[in-house]
């Protein structure tokens, strides 16, 4: 159904990282505008991005209300300048998005190594606990607050003089690893949610190496 001079949106795609969630679609509008609606499986539809000429809509504010819910969105197409116009069935043209469950599907953002400190033959590496847009009691929650022990970090570490990457894992934001005395090491971390079947890994953090500003060395 729909008017003859509007086309339905297509390629509806969720783009979500650390719960910042945008719905994208095609085509770029020609003589038409879009409105987006979002709902949980059991909830009412809520309209967002009214009569927009954009082909994306930020739905973060809606999905952060309950990141474990499954959401569905739909994009309505209206003739530009005549948004009251409806199709032959008395309803504007629309297309449904795939279902989206933020907790299971949001991409893990690139982590950052906050600091590393060497004490003798041990190095403590700390990963920054990134803030998300999920709120509880008017406070923004960190990634660790949201995922708890479901979130682990994998540390890759290697001697500056070699290429083989050793690994360590933690379900906190800290690693304590053994290193060889007198050797400089480089570090990179990856966030992982092992219980997922897709989107399990983040991209790697920027590499940080000993002998650079971020670290601290203490000989004991």
């Amino acid at each position: 159904s729909g008017t003859t001079n509007t086309v339905a949106a297509y390629n509806l795609t969720w783009k979500s990282t650390n719960f910042k969630t945008i719905l994208e679609w095609e085509p770029k509008p020609v003589n038409q505008v879009y409105t987006v609606q979002i709902s949980t499986k059991s909830g009412d539809w809520k309209s967002k991005c009214f009569y927009t000429t954009d082909t994306e809509c930020d739905l973060t504010d809606e999905i952060v209300k309950d990141v474990k819910q499954t959401y569905l969105a739909r994009v309505f197409s209206y003739p530009a300048g005549n948004v009251e116009s409806t199709g032959s069935a008395g309803e504007p043209l629309y297309e449904n998005s795939p279902e989206f469950t933020p907790y299971l599907e949001t991409n893990l953002g690139q982590p950052t190594i906050q600091s590393f400190e060497q004490v003798g033959t041990k190095v403590n590496v700390t990963v920054e606990d990134e803030r998300t847009l999920v709120r509880r009691n008017n406070t923004f929650l960190s990634l660790r607050d949201v995922f708890g022990k479901d979130l682990i970090y994998t540390l890759y570490y290697w001697k500056s003089s070699s290429s083989g990457k050793k690994t360590a894992k933690t379900n906190t934001n800290e690693f304590l690893i053994d290193v060889d005395k007198g050797e400089n090491y480089c570090f990179s971390v990856q966030a992982v949610i092992p219980s997922r079947t897709v989107n399990r890994k983040s991209t790697d953090s920027p590499v940080e190496c000993m002998g650079q500003e971020k670290g601290e060395f203490r000989e004991i």
Epitope: Y156, Q190, R200
Partner: antibody, heavy 120, light 107 residues
Framework: EVQLVESGGGLVQPGGSLRLSCAAS????????IHWVRQAPGKGLEWVGY????????YYADSVRGRFTISADTSKNTAYLQMNSLRAEDTAVYYC?????????????WGQGTLVTVSS | DIQMTQSPSSLSASVGDRVTITCRAS??????VAWYQQKPGKAPKLLIY???FLYSGVPSRFSGSRSGTDFTLTISSLQPEDFATYYC?????????FGQGTKVEIK
């Protein structure tokens, strides 16, 4: 269903090369880690090395470092073990295996193995 | 590298027996120890992970425990299909290392 299928084994002369393949199905290799483990005839299990197909990071056992190279083609969902400068002591069944990647579970699925014989 | 010393290297037992296999780590590995079962000509199968957790589909007669750096695999009542070789493995640090294996044979 998760499956790992190795291929490429066979008879090779000392000093020769061989490339083993590990074709994965039922999961995406870039979401996990892939290990190679070998077992000489009548002997125990020996870890060879791993790859994180997502970023290409690898690490090898001392016994094979500099001779063996692990790689992955995520578009084919396949990992590889390139073995150069082969020695008689490399004769073994070679298994590829999936690392679940959690703190608790390590290797949860293994391939059926492929036999590599190094002999003149 | 961390050494995993497994004992005994072999044992003979009868159906219904309680069987215990031990692995000692050369240094602290926390609970990052798995146990695998391997039958001749077959790939290993995961039995126990994180020292004491039973992997999905594994019979409850298998159990694992930890005491410091000592890890134990127990089969409470040996069944005919349990005659196989068992390996422990630590994955606390890279490289991961296996025990030498314990062959459980029919008495």
């Amino acid at each position: 269903e998760v499956q790992l299928v190795e291929s490429g084994g066979g008879l090779v002369q000392p000093g020769g090369s061989l490339r083993l393949s590990c074709a994965a199905s039922g999961f995406t290799i870039s979401d996990y880690w892939i290990h190679w483990v070998r077992q000489a005839p009548g002997k125990g299990l020996e870890w060879v090395g791993y790859i994180d197909p997502y970023n290409g990071y690898t690490y090898y056992a001392d016994s094979v470092r500099g001779r063996f190279t692990i790689s992955a083609d995520t578009s084919k969902n396949t990992a590889y073990l390139q073995m150069n400068s082969l020695r008689a002591e490399d004769t073994a069944v070679y298994y590829c295996a999936r690392d679940y990647g959690s703190l608790q579970v390590f290797i949860d699925y293994w391939g059926q193995g492929t036999l590599v014989t190094v002999s003149s | 590298d961390i050494q995993m010393t497994q004992s005994p290297s072999s044992l003979s037992a009868s159906v219904g027996d309680r069987v215990t296999i031990t692995c000692r780590a050369s240094q602290d590995v926390n609970t990052a120890v798995a146990w695998y079962q391997q039958k001749p000509g077959k790939a290993p199968k995961l039995l126990i992970y994180s020292a004491s957790f039973l992997y999905s589909g594994v019979p409850s007669r298998f159990s694992g425990s930890r005491s410091g750096t000592d890890f134990t695999l127990t089969i409470s009542s040996l069944q005919p299909e349990d005659f196989a070789t068992y390996y422990c493995q630590q994955h606390y640090t890279t490289p991961p290392t296996f025990g030498q294996g314990t062959k459980v044979e029919i008495k």
